[in-house]
Interface confidence: low
C-alpha cells in the first residue's frame, strides 16, 4: 500500500498525523508557545507525495518561526513609539495625541504570543465628530476622516495581513458606527481561551439574567441578545464533523456544546436549542420546532447520541447546508406561529458554529446568512434579534476571511474567531457563562473562572465583625439581608458598633455597611440545657441582619439562592408547582452530599452532609464530648433534627471565626444555601494568627473532629415569617 | 448648585485684547465631565459660541473657525475659574459674552445647562 | 457650515399652545436643545437631547426632532413664556444656535 515519506520533522516543533502515513491523512505541525510553524500542514496524496497547501514545491523544510504583531501603518493625530516594520513577542508600542486630542484606548500596548496586540486601539479623538472617530486598528489603513451622521469610512489591511470586523463602517443617526472594529491579524494568529470567553459570554451574559421574572424593579440591562421578558432564545448550535476534524475533536465539540447547553439551562430564560452536525450534509439531531428542545435533559441526551460516523460517507465541509438548515427551521417556525405575530418576532436568534476549517463545497455560507437575516427582518432596530458566532478550531485551515464574513458585526462586540485547538474551545465553553456580571439580584451567580477572585467565587459571603476584631461570616440572601448565626450576637445588644463587610469590585476590602436592624431568633439560648449537662446548646443558632442601604449588586457582590423560594426554583428550572419538599428532595438527596463553606482567608473549602443512616453515625461521636456535655445520655438533646452534620473522612472543619457563613451546594452552575455554620467539636485554626492557617485533626483525636450546620429546611416557619414580603416562598 | 460668575471691563479700545474671567462654584474647572465655554450674543449675529476649555487627564482647547487665530482660553485651577483673551477686537466683536458649563458631544451632552450672568462688552474708541 | 434656521416671531393666546420650529439638514440625526432667554437675562436649558427636560422646567415643555426638524412646544402658554427661544445643536466641532425665535403671549 502506497504511504508517505516519514523525512518530515520540523525543527523546534512537533507534528501529529491524521490517519497514519497513508493517504487522505493530515500532517499538522506545532510549535512552541511564540512561534508558529511555517508550513502549517502537509497532506499526504495518493501518489504517496506529501502536499503542502499553497506551496510551490512539494516538500519545503518545516521551521518555526517567531510570531510577530504587526506595526501601525498610520496613527492620526499623535505619535507612536517605536517605529518598527513589526514586533517581537513581548515587544510595546506606546501612543501619545497631540495637543486638543483626547487618547481614547490602550496608551501602551504589548506583542502577545498569539501574535495579537493586548489592550484596545489607540484613537485621538476630539469629539467632534457625530460618531466617535473610530481609530485605524495596527496593522490597517482607513479611507474615510468625516464622523458625520451617513459618512462611511473603509479599511483595508497591509500586506500578508488579513482583516476581521468590518471593512466599511458608517456612522448611525445615534452617533455610533455600524458594524464592529476591523482588525488585522497575521494569518497564523488565533484567539486566547481568555480573550474570547468573555468576548462571546458579553453578548449571552445580559440576556441571562434578562428574564429573571422574579425582579422585582425592571433594570436595563443594556444591549447584547437581550431577551425581553416575554421574549424567548433560540440557539442553535453547529458542529462540523467533516473528515479533517478527529473524532477525538468531535468529542470534544460535542463536550463544549453540552457544557453551554448545561449553562444556558440554568438561567431562567425561555430557550430552544437546535443542535445540527455537519459535514457533506448536515444532519439535524433537534429542532426548535420540537417542543423536546427547551428540556435540558432531551437536548443533552440529543447531543450524546450524535455520532461522529453519522457523516462517514460525506466528509467535506459544507457549512451554506448546515446555515440553511438554520433557515429552514426558522422558516417552518415563523409559518408556524404567523409572520406577522409577536411570538415569532419576539424570538431572539443566536447561531453559534464549531468548525476546523472552511467550507469547501455547497457554495457560499454568506448566501445562507443572508437569507437568516432577510427572515428575521434584520435592520439597525432589529439587529439585537440575531447573534452569529463563528469559531474555528485549530490554526490549520481556518479560513479567517470566511470566519469574519459569517460571524455578525456589532459595536463594541466580536463575533468571530479562531481557538488554537480544541482543549482551548472546551477552555472557553467552560468560562463563557461566568454571568456574574449581570445587574440585578439573580441569585446564586458566582464567577467559576480559573481566574476569578475567592469573593468573586462566593459572592455573597460576608464579614460581620464589632469594631475591634472579625467575628463572624454571612451570606447576602437579597440585596438588603444577610443571614447569619444567632450566637455571634450573644454578646451584647449595641449593633450600631457592629459592621457587615461585603465584596465591592472596586475593593480588595470590601464595603463596609451598617445594621439597620438584627433580628435573633427567639428561640437561641446558648446556656437553655445547663441544668441537663449541657454546657453549650445552639439550637435555633439563626439570625438575620438588614443593611442600613441596598448593596449595589456586582461581580463581587449578589445573593445566594435559598431553597425554598421561587428565585431557586428558577435556577433549578423546577417545575412551577414545585414544594419545599421538592427542593429538600432535590439538594440533599444521597446519604452523603458534597458541600462547601468559605474559610477566613476567602477560599472555599469542601464538607460532606451526612444524611439519613449516616447523619445518626456522624452526630453520634458527640457523647464522646465529656467536657462540653459531661453527663450526656442522649445525643439528640444536643444535636437536634435542626442541624446538618460533617466532618467525617476528608472533610475540612470550619474554625472559631467561620460560623454564620453559608453551607452550601452547587447545582445547574448556581449555588444554593442549606445550612450555616454553627459549632463543632474542633477548632483547626486554634492557635494560629494566620488566616491561612489550618491544622487537621490528629487521627487518634477523641472525639473525632465534627461540625454542625443549621439546616435551612427546618427553619422554615422562621425564615417566612421575617422574609415574607423580601423572597417569594413556595409551600412548604 | 453650580454658579458661574463673570468679571471684566465693559468697554474695550478697539485693536486691544478683551480678557473676561468666569469664576466657577459647585463645581471644578478640571472635572473630568463637564467643558468650559465661552459664547457671545450680539443683535447682528445671534449667539454665536466662541471656544471651550477641557480636562481629560490633561487640558484641552477649542476654538470656533472665525476667531481660533486671535483667540485663548485659560484655565486657573488655583482659582477654579477660566478666562477668555480676545486679541486686536473691532466694533465687530461688540456683545454680549457669556461663560457657560457644557459636557461632550461624544457623551450625549451637547448642550450648556448653565450659564453666566453675561457681561456687555462695547468696542470703541 | 451648519446653519439653523427658526421662524423669526410667533404669536400666541394665554392656554394655546405654541410650537416653535428649528430646521436643519438631517437635524434629527443630531441631539437638538432649547434655550428661553428673557430679556435682559442669561438663556435658560429648557429641553435636551431632543426631549428631555432640565429638572425645575415646568411640564408644559415638550420638544421632538425627526427629519431635518426640531420642534419645542409649549402647551397651555402663559405670561411668563414670553421670551426668546434658540434651539442649539452640535456639529463637526462646534455648537450651533438657531437663528431665534420672539414668541409674543397676546
Known amino acids: 500500500a502506497t504511504s508517505c515519506p516519514q523525512n518530515v520533522n520540523i525543527s523546534g516543533g512537533t507534528f501529529t498525523l491524521s490517519h497514519g502515513w497513508a493517504p487522505g491523512s493530515l500532517l499538522i505541525y506545532s510549535c512552541p508557545q511564540g512561534l508558529y510553524p511555517s508550513p502549517a500542514s502537509r497532506l499526504c496524496k495518493s501518489s504517496g507525495q506529501w502536499q503542502t497547501p499553497r506551496a510551490t514545491r512539494s516538500l519545503t523544510k518545516a521551521v518555526c518561526k517567531p510570531v510577530r504583531c504587526p506595526a501601525p501603518v498610520s496613527f492620526e493625530n499623535g505619535i507612536y513609539t517605536p517605529r518598527l516594520g513589526s514586533y517581537p513577542v513581548g515587544g510595546n508600542v506606546s501612543f501619545e495625541c497631540e495637543d486638543g486630542f483626547i487618547l481614547r484606548g490602550s496608551p501602551v500596548r504589548q506583542c502577545r504570543p498569539n501574535g495579537m496586540w493586548d489592550g484596545e486601539t489607540a484613537v485621538c479623538d476630539n469629539g467632534a465628530g457625530h460618531c466617535p472617530n473610530p481609530g485605524i486598528s495596527l496593522g490597517a489603513v482607513r479611507t474615510g476622516s468625516r464622523f458625520g451622521h451617513g459618512d462611511k469610512v473603509r479599511y483595508r489591511c497591509s500586506s500578508n495581513l488579513v482583516l476581521t470586523g468590518s471593512a466599511e463602517r458608517e456612522c448611525q443617526g445615534n452617533g455610533v458606527w455600524s458594524g464592529t472594529e476591523p482588525i488585522c491579524r497575521q494569518p497564523y494568529s488565533y484567539d486566547f481561551p481568555e480573550d474570547v470567553a468573555p468576548a462571546l459570554g458579553t453578548s449571552f451574559s445580559h440576556m441571562l439574567g434578562a428574564t429573571n421574572p422574579t425582579q422585582r424593579t425592571k433594570e436595563s440591562l443594556g444591549r447584547k441578545i437581550q431577551i425581553q421578558r416575554s421574549g424567548h432564545l433560540n440557539l442553535y448550535l453547529l458542529l462540523d464533523s467533516s473528515q479533517s476534524v478527529s473524532e477525538n475533536d468531535f468529542l470534544i465539540f460535542k463536550e463544549s456544546a453540552s457544557l453551554m447547553v448545561d449553562r444556558i439551562f440554568s438561567f431562567e430564560i425561555n430557550v430552544s436549542v437546535a443542535i445540527i452536525t455537519f459535514a457533506s450534509e448536515p444532519k439535524v439531531l433537534m429542532s426548535v420546532l420540537n417542543v423536546n428542545s427547551r428540556d435540558i435533559t432531551e437536548v443533552i441526551s440529543s447531543l450524546e447520541n450524535a455520532k461522529y460516523k453519522d457523516h462517514e460517507n460525506g466528509t467535506g465541509t459544507n457549512t451554506y447546508a448546515a446555515l440553511n438548515s438554520v433557515y429552514l427551521m426558522m422558516n417552518n417556525q415563523m409559518q408556524l406561529l404567523g409572520m406577522k405575530t409577536m411570538a415569532w418576532q419576539e424570538i431572539r436568534h443566536a447561531i453559534i458554529l464549531l468548525t476546523d476549517g472552511k467550507s469547501n463545497m455547497g457554495g457560499s455560507p454568506k448566501t445562507a446568512v443572508d437569507q437568516i437575516r432577510e427572515i428575521l427582518n434584520i435592520n439597525q432596530k432589529r439587529n439585537d434579534y440575531l447573534d452569529i458566532y463563528a469559531i474555528g478550531v485549530g490554526k490549520l485551515d481556518v479560513d479567517w476571511r470566511e470566519l469574519n464574513e459569517l460571524g455578525s458585526k456589532k459595536d463594541g462586540e466580536r463575533h468571530a474567531f479562531i481557538l488554537q485547538d480544541t482543549k482551548a474551545l472546551h477552555q472557553v465553553f467552560e468560562h463563557m457563562l461566568d454571568v456574574s456580571k449581570l445587574t440585578d439580584t439573580i441569585c446564586g451567580v458566582g464567577n467559576m473562572s480559573a481566574n476569578a477572585s475567592d469573593q468573586e467565587r462566593t459572592p455573597w459571603h460576608v464579614t460581620i465583625k464589632p469594631k475591634s476584631q472579625e467575628t463572624c461570616r454571612g451570606a447576602l440572601i437579597s440585596d438588603q439581608w444577610v443571614l447569619t448565626a444567632a450566637h455571634c450576637f450573644r454578646d451584647g445588644n449595641d449593633h450600631s458598633l457592629w459592621r457587615v463587610n461585603v465584596g465591592d469590585p472596586k475593593s480588595q476590602w470590601g464595603k463596609e455597611f451598617l445594621i439597620e436592624k438584627a433580628v435573633i431568633s427567639p428561640g437561641f439560648d446558648v446556656f437553655a440545657k445547663k441544668n441537663q449537662g449541657i454546657l453549650e446548646f445552639y439550637g435555633d443558632d439563626i439570625a438575620l441582619l438588614k443593611l442600613a442601604q441596598k448593596v449595589k449588586m456586582s461581580t463581587h457582590a449578589r445573593p445566594i439562592c435559598l431553597p425554598c423560594t421561587m428565585e431557586a426554583n428558577l435556577a433549578l428550572r423546577r417545575p412551577q408547582g414545585s414544594t419545599c419538599r421538592d427542593h429538600e428532595n432535590e439538594l440533599l438527596n444521597k446519604q452523603s452530599v458534597p458541600a462547601h463553606f468559605v474559610a477566613l482567608n476567602g477560599s472555599k473549602l469542601n464538607i460532606n452532609l451526612k444524611m439519613g443512616v449516616e447523619w445518626t453515625s456522624c452526630a453520634e461521636v458527640v457523647s464522646q464530648e465529656k467536657t462540653m456535655f459531661p453527663n450526656l445520655t442522649d445525643v439528640r438533646e444536643v444535636v437536634t433534627d435542626q442541624f446538618l452534620c460533617s466532618g467525617t473522612q476528608e472533610d475540612e472543619s470550619p474554625c472559631k471565626g467561620e460560623s454564620g457563613g453559608a453551607v452550601f451546594l452547587e447545582r445547574r452552575f448556581r449555588f444554593f444555601q442549606v445550612g450555616l455554620v454553627s459549632w463543632g467539636l474542633y477548632n483547626p485554626c486554634l492557635g494560629s494568627a494566620d488566616k491561612n492557617s489550618r491544622k487537621r485533626a490528629p487521627r487518634s483525636k477523641v472525639p473525632p473532629p465534627r461540625d454542625f450546620h443549621i439546616n435551612l429546611f427546618r427553619m422554615q416557619p422562621w425564615l417566612r415569617q421575617h422574609l415574607g414580603d423580601v423572597l417569594n416562598f413556595l409551600p412548604l | 448648585q453650580v454658579q458661574l460668575q463673570q468679571s471684566g471691563p465693559g468697554l474695550v479700545k478697539p485693536s486691544q485684547p478683551l480678557s473676561l474671567t468666569c469664576a466657577i462654584s459647585?463645581?471644578?474647572?478640571?472635572?473630568?465631565?463637564?467643558?468650559w465655554s465661552w459664547i457671545r450674543q450680539s443683535p447682528s449675529r445671534g449667539l454665536e459660541w466662541l471656544g471651550r476649555?477641557?480636562?481629560?487627564?490633561?487640558?484641552?482647547?477649542d476654538y470656533a473657525v472665525f476667531v481660533k487665530s486671535r483667540m485663548t482660553i485659560n484655565p486657573d485651577t488655583s482659582k477654579n475659574q477660566f478666562s477668555l483673551q480676545l486679541n486686536s477686537v473691532t466694533p465687530e466683536d461688540t456683545a454680549v459674552y457669556y461663560c457657560?458649563?457644557?459636557?461632550?458631544?461624544?457623551?450625549?451632552?451637547?448642550?450648556?445647562?448653565?450659564w453666566g450672568q453675561g457681561i456687555l462688552v462695547t468696542v470703541s474708541s | 457650515s451648519y446653519e439653523l434656521t427658526q421662524p423669526p416671531s410667533l404669536s400666541v393666546s394665554p392656554g394655546q399652545t405654541a410650537s416653535i420650529t428649528c430646521s436643519g439638514h438631517?437635524?434629527?440625526?443630531?441631539?437638538a436643545c432649547w434655550y428661553q432667554q428673557k430679556p435682559g437675562q442669561s438663556p435658560v436649558l429648557v429641553i435636551y437631547?431632543?426631549?428631555k427636560r432640565p429638572s425645575g422646567i415646568p411640564e408644559r415643555f415638550s420638544g421632538s426632532n425627526s427629519g431635518n426638524t426640531a420642534t419645542l412646544t409649549i402647551s397651555g402658554t402663559q405670561a411668563l413664556d414670553e421670551a426668546d427661544y434658540y434651539c442649539?445643536?452640535?456639529?463637526?466641532?462646534?455648537?450651533?444656535f438657531g437663528t431665534g425665535t420672539k414668541v409674543t403671549v397676546l
Open positions: 457657560a458649563r457644557g459636557g461632550m458631544p461624544a457623551s450625549d451632552i451637547p448642550h450648556f445647562d448653565n
Open positions: 442649539q445643536a452640535w456639529d463637526s466641532i462646534t455648537y450651533v
Open positions: 438631517k437635524l434629527g440625526d443630531k441631539y
Open positions: 437631547q431632543d426631549n
Open positions: 459647585g463645581d471644578s474647572v478640571s472635572s473630568n465631565s463637564a467643558t
Open positions: 476649555t477641557y480636562y481629560r487627564s490633561k487640558w484641552y482647547h
